[in-house]
């Protein structure tokens, strides 16, 4: 048994910084408890964006301090960041884990590349 | 940098006890999920037990399971393990290991030894 | 539990030699959640490959793993003296996480 992990290929951030996307994990096992970490992967260096436990039937919760949301419905994650500039672009990885009960399963998606293009400015009116 | 320094190793008789420390430095410790590994003189690696982000959830191998307890104090970026009815066959090196962003042990302690002799 | 069995236990080469170490799995390991490490004696384990073929930070090109479901290989595609060392596999996708017996790569 192993636990596979689909996210879009490409998402295109909004011009206020907001991408959004769908993170989906074939779950082997009932998990109660499910950690879900969105990882950012540049230059082979990964880095940690955002994390959540929650409970099955439960709300996801990030850190207030957080820059992503999320809502959850069976074994499906829809994750939203925000604040995204373009030197943000770059892959984002949906990491799940199922943490309880026994036993445990990681699974990684691929990741989602994330192109994120900062808003021309106003032109200064006269 | 990464740093993981293992201690309380020692030598201890059959059916006593002993708890191992291993002081995180240089990452964040609550973001990460940590492991303690054992290999006896001469033999191959064995994974001992595993503990998540905030000490909630704990798994053991079956071979240490009811003796062992693995705890974390992250306030302190300390790692623990508490050996209960120790047995001959629980001399080993002990290492504490650090699980890495995409699942492997990227980082590891210099081990302590643990010799279990009457 | 996911059982892995390394061979050759043993392996005698000469430096500028390639080595193919072997990993069998008893079942899938999915997504290829294997991992490699070096170890060297009165040292601790080192990662070398992770994800099966992904190298860690600051391993050289020398390395390179492959595989997928139940059989993997780490391939060391010309033996420096430094080289000589266990290696181990361990599967990281599931409880409990289990390691591979060693293959001792020695001097011939």
């Known amino acids: 048994k192993a636990m596979h992990v689909a996210q879009p290929a490409v998402v295109l951030a909004s011009s206020r910084g907001i991408a959004s996307f769908v993170c989906e994990y074939a779950s082997p096992g009932k998990a109660t408890e499910v950690r879900v970490t969105v990882l950012r992967q540049a230059d082979s260096q990964v880095t940690e964006v955002c994390a959540a436990t929650y409970m099955m039937g439960n709300e996801l919760t990030f850190l207030d301090d957080s820059i992503c949301t999320g809502t959850s419905s069976g074994n499906q994650v829809n994750l939203t960041i925000q604040g995204l500039r373009a030197m943000d672009t770059g892959l984002y990885i949906c990491k799940v884990e199922l943490m309880y009960p026994p036993p445990y399963y990681l699974g990684i998606g691929n990741g989602t590349q994330i192109y994120v293009i900062d808003p021309e400015p106003c032109p200064d009116s006269d | 940098q990464v740093q993981l320094v293992e201690s309380g190793g020692g030598v201890v008789q059959p059916g006593r006890s002993l708890r191992l420390s291993c002081a995180a430095s240089g990452f964040t410790f609550s973001s990460y999920t940590m492991h303690w590994v054992r290999q006896a003189p001469g033999k191959g690696l064995e994974w001992v037990t595993f503990i998540s982000y905030d000490g909630h959830n704990k798994y053991y191998a079956d071979s240490v399971k009811g003796r062992f307890t693995i705890s974390r104090d992250n306030s302190k970026n300390t790692l623990y393990l508490q050996m209960n009815s120790l047995r001959a066959e629980d001399t080993a090196i002990y290492y504490c290991?650090?699980?890495?962003?995409?699942?492997?042990?990227?980082?590891w302690g210099q081990g302590t030894l643990v010799t279990v002799s009457s | 539990e996911i059982v892995l069995t390394q061979s050759p236990g043993t392996l005698s080469l000469s430096p500028g030699e390639r080595a193919t170490l072997s990993c069998r799995a008893s079942q899938e390991v999915g997504d290829s959640y294997l991992a490699w490490y070096q170890q060297k004696p009165g040292q601790a384990p080192r990662l070398l490959i992770y994800g099966a073929f992904s190298r860690a930070t600051g391993i050289p090109d020398r390395f390179s793993g492959s595989g997928s479901g139940t059989d993997f290989t780490l391939t060391i595609s010309r033996l420096e003296p430094e080289d000589f060392a266990v290696y181990y596999c361990q599967q990281y996708g599931s409880s409990p996480w289990t390691f591979g017996q060693g293959t001792k790569v020695e001097i011939k």
């Open positions: 290991a650090r699980t890495g962003w995409l699942g492997p042990f990227d980082y």
